[in-house]
């Protein structure tokens, strides 16, 4: 079966997706959508992927989306969420991209890519 | 733009051996997984194998394990698929395909496809 | 071994729906992606993680996926939808492919 430890271009990829995110935004990041934000310190991409799943027609995040679930081993639906989540507490999509941006490139500094 | 270019297809005699690659370029080719997918003239699909980016996990179909071999050179941005003790059954299309992003790639989406590099096995 | 099946074939008229399944044992539980395949072209991906659009893909395509079976519709078939269509799947650290369907776009 697959490697659990994502190879560390992917992960590159993906942080260069979120850079593009953030450096390219002009209006609000999908107009203002809030999102459950999600406990940082593990199981990372498949807690993002849950969160950002419920955010429908939004094309500047569907590419970020898509490359997550190269990241989580299982099928994510929307209204699915895990224990990762911050109990009742929503952000903007714009803020979630920015927190988890800064997270992965720390973990790709550190070399922790799982 | 991403593009993919098989090559090394041809006719060759039941038992023999032959070599396709494909040549990728507009995409950072060490970052995905890439898979070979054949079409027998007249047939369906049929998934052959698939090499992970850089975890280098590699997939084979039933119908081809310990004949066929799936390798990739990230420095010359190309995949190979080493075909061995063909038979008349391995007739077909060859397209090469570039598959998923990360260790979970079949999770993401066969994007983009070659034009398809014809093998043909017949005496 | 990990079957998709589909019907040979489905027709209909121009501007009519286009319903194909797919099925499998709990498919529902896996990622259902559909190709296009014209006469002599390449395949291509028309929906992705059950019912996700690749951008350049025409809205009229749209996808779903539960229980056992995925199902790709065409709402307001055109005569340039005509092709064959396969679905996929992955199970135990392979792909499979489905059988494969030919639409017919009558008239």
């Known amino acids: 079966s697959p490697s659990p430890v994502p190879p560390s271009t992917a992960l590159k990829e993906l942080i260069e997706e979120l850079v593009n995110i953030t450096q390219n935004q002009k209006a609000p990041l999908c107009n203002g959508s809030m999102v459950w934000s999600i406990n940082l310190t593990a199981g990372v991409y498949c807690a993002a992927l849950e969160s950002l799943i419920n955010v429908s027609g939004c094309s500047a995040i569907e590419k970020t989306q898509r490359m997550l679930n190269g990241f989580c081993p299982h099928k994510v639906s929307a209204g699915q969420f895990s224990s990762l989540r911050v109990r009742d507490t929503k952000i903007e999509v714009a803020q979630f991209v920015k927190d988890l941006l800064v997270h992965l490139k720390k973990l790709f500094r550190e070399g922790q890519f799982n | 733009e991403v593009q993919l270019l098989e090559s090394g297809g041809g006719l060759v005699q039941p038992g023999g051996s032959l070599r396709l690659s494909c040549a990728a370029s507009g995409f950072t080719f060490s970052s995905y997984a890439m898979s070979w997918v054949r079409q027998a003239p007249g047939k369906g699909l049929e998934w052959v194998s698939a090499f992970s980016g850089s975890g280098g996990s590699t997939y084979y179909a039933d119908s081809v394990k310990g004949r066929f071999t799936i390798s990739r050179d990230n420095s010359k941005n190309t995949l190979y698929l080493q075909m061995n003790s063909l038979r008349a059954e391995d007739t077909a299309v060859y397209y090469c395909?570039?598959?998923?992003?990360?260790?979970?790639?079949?999770?993401?989406?066969?994007?983009?496809w070659g034009q398809g590099t014809t093998v043909t096995v017949s005496s | 071994s990990y079957e998709l099946t589909q019907p040979p074939s489905v027709s209909v008229s121009p501007g009519q729906t286009a319903s194909i399944t797919c099925s499998g044992d709990k498919l529902g539980d896996k990622y259902a992606c559909w190709f296009q395949q014209k006469p002599g072209q390449s395949p291509v991906l028309v929906i992705y993680h059950d019912s996700k659009r690749p951008s350049g893909i025409p809205e009229r395509f749209s996808g779903s996926n539960s229980g056992d079976t995925a199902t790709l519709t065409i709402s307001g078939t055109q005569a340039m939808d005509e092709a064959d269509y396969y679905c996929q799947a992955w199970d135990s650290s392979t792909y499979v492919f489905g059988t494969g369907t030919k639409v017919t776009v009558l008239g």
């Open positions: 395909v570039q598959d998923g992003l990360g260790p979970y790639f079949y999770n993401y989406g066969m994007d983009v």
